[in-house]
Interface confidence: low
């Protein structure tokens, strides 16, 4: 009598998540009498996938009618495949008895699930940094299979090279995650810059997924300060201007001090944007020279984005302004542009 063969023709089957997988199995003989069962895995811990006689297997259906006489095709179809369904499936013939006895197993079919990576999520630094500093951006994507994946970083269309990427777990898994960190050196022109994390995977059919982050959320461009004095007015008032230029973000507080005493505080708001994304702001102070006996030390103090104040001071020489005339003598600028390196 010819020995019974259990034939699983495919060594492996690859299916996209959400699709159906067909696992083929035929037997070479109708005898001995007994059922066919499908298992995932081998050995004592194997998982029963399909048993014609009993049990409820809502996602598994036989390909042909197993109740027909002379049926030798015991192939099954598993619907709505997820990465958790990956594994090796065995078609096993039993001899009828009490209990049924395992007679022969097929060679097994390895089911691998192609699952798409999630949309990459790019996160930037928790605190802003200034130009010439290096900041890190992180990109994460999850749930893909197989493990092979390509991740690239771009800044304004140019690929970044200071990148460290890990795919987890290192061993075999139903699905994988990728995490990559890119280090970017900021420049003062980066307010409008963007970093892009691009993920390419076999499931994406050549169209990579992209996640983006705007460097505007990571950069701080400290202001330049310049204090100038306009001509003396006929009423003995001097108009002093503090120009605060090329700063980002807009969050800025300006305080005028006369001889160390606070004269006025202003907050920047609704400023027009420069082409490079930075902002400019001009504040002015009218100083009544007649009201002062001695020289007046004026300080323009700027607090930008919660950072230590930047000052610019200079003196208005009262002696140079006789009270009875409207002189055009320029103020002596004794201040320095004190800049903090953050």
């Amino acid at each position: 009598e010819e020995e019974l063969q259990v034939i699983q023709p495919e060594k492996s089957v690859s299916v996209a998540a959400g699709d159906s997988a067909t696992l083929n199995c035929t037997v070479s003989s109708l005898i001995p009498v007994g059922p066919i069962q499908w298992f995932r895995g081998a050995g004592p811990g194997r998982e029963l996938i399909y048993n014609l006689k009993e049990g409820h297997f809502p996602r598994v259906t036989p390909v042909s009618d197993p109740t027909k006489r002379n049926n030798m095709d015991f192939s099954i179809r598993i619907s709505n495949i997820t990465p958790a369904d990956a594994g090796t499936y065995y078609c096993v013939k039993f001899r009828k008895g009490s209990p049924d006895v395992e007679l022969k197993s097929g060679a097994g079919t390895e089911l691998s699930v192609r699952a798409k990576p999630s949309a990459p999520v790019v996160s930037g630094p928790a605190v802003r940094a200034t130009a010439e500093h290096t900041v890190s951006f992180t990109c994460e994507s999850h749930g893909f299979s197989p493990r092979d994946i390509t991740l690239k970083w771009f800044k304004n269309g140019n690929e970044l090279s200071d990148v460290q990427t890990n795919v987890d777990p290192a061993g075999k898994s139903v699905s994988y995650s990728i995490r990559s960190t890119a280090r970017v050196v900021l420049t003062r022109r980066d307010v409008h810059s963007q970093v892009i994390c691009e993920v390419a995977h076999v499931t994406l059919q050549g169209d990579p997924l992209r996640g983006t982050a705007n460097l505007s959320e990571a950069i701080r461009v400290p202001p330049f300060l310049e204090v100038t004095q306009q001509s003396m007015r006929a009423d003995n008032q001097v108009n002093v201007t503090c120009q605060v230029t090329k700063f980002y973000p807009q969050r800025l507080q300006l305080t005028w001090l006369e001889n160390g005493n606070v004269s006025r505080t202003e907050m920047a708001s609704a400023l027009p944007e420069n082409k490079d994304g930075t902002y400019n702001w001009t504040s002015w102070l009218l100083v009544n020279v007649s009201a002062h006996r001695d020289d007046v030390k004026l300080t323009c103090q700027v607090e930008h984005d919660g950072q230590p104040a930047v000052n610019k001071s200079f003196s208005v020489k009262v002696s140079a302004h006789p009270k009875e005339q409207g002189s055009n003598t320029a103020a002596e600028n004794t201040g320095t542009n004190e800049r903090n390196i953050y």
């Epitope: 798409k116 949309a119 994406l204 059919q205 169209d207 997924l209």
Partner: antibody
């Protein structure tokens, strides 16, 4: 920057047809699926379906099969919604909205929206 | 179809308050949930995707949480520009469905 600009308001009589356009700029239209969302006056948002901008294949939600047609002209980066045999209950604002990509199973979240086109159907 | 139920339908709050809007799905949607803000006469604006991630440019006072069937949108330190209608949307299963909306009004 990325923008979806829709055609202007329309006043139509019952039984007529209307074609709403949605022009994409700032990105390649074929990289992202284009969805259509309806908002009746004073009501919430209702997803009508989407068009796969790479293949041109439309997918319609249950209540929008038949009189509603999604189409695409990639040469002018524009998606279209055509409604035929208009009824009074079609009066609504129609939005186009893009999702992260036709390659996602789920269609995704709508990251950019058009400004909306009001279609009024009245005799 | 998956039903999305938001609560409350409307609420009143003051500038500086912290408010929470909840969204419940009739079946598991994983983390495939987005939140949108809509002001009268304007198109919706995307705030949150994948239940917890803010879109670029969305202030950090907006935060999302939850997975499965129960989700929340929290707005801390409410600002005048935050008074609007908020919608949740699931994109786990076709058809994509929205909540009925929560109108946030100034007290």
């Amino acid at each position: 920057q990325i923008q979806l600009v829709q055609s202007g308001s329309e006043l139509k009589k019952p039984g007529a047809s209307v074609k709403v356009s949605c022009k994409a700029s700032g990105y390649s239209i074929t990289d992202y699926a284009m969805n259509w969302v309806r908002q009746a006056p004073g009501q919430g948002l209702e997803w009508m379906g989407f068009i796969n901008t790479y293949t041109g294949e439309p997918t319609y939600a249950q209540g929008f099969k038949g009189r509603f047609v999604f189409s695409l002209d990639t040469s002018v980066s524009t998606a279209y919604l055509q409604i035929s045999s208009l009824k009074a209950e079609d009066t609504a604002v129609y939005y186009c909205a893009r999702t992260r990509g036709y390659y996602d199973f789920d269609g995704g979240a709508f990251d950019y929206w058009g400004q909306g086109t009001l279609v009024t159907v009245s005799s | 179809d998956i039903q999305m139920t938001q609560s409350p339908s409307s609420l009143s709050a003051s500038v500086g308050d912290r408010v929470t809007i909840t969204c419940r799905a009739s079946q598991n949607v994983g983390t495939h949930l987005a939140w949108y803000q809509q002001k009268p006469g304007k198109s919706p604006k995307a705030l949150i995707f994948s239940a917890i991630y803010r879109y670029i440019g969305v202030p950090s006072r907006f935060s999302g949480s939850g997975s499965g069937t129960d989700f929340t949108l929290t707005i801390s330190n409410l600002q005048p520009e935050d008074f609007a209608t908020y919608y949740c949307q699931q994109y786990n299963t076709y058809p994509l469905t929205f909540g009925q909306g929560t109108k946030l009004e100034i007290k």
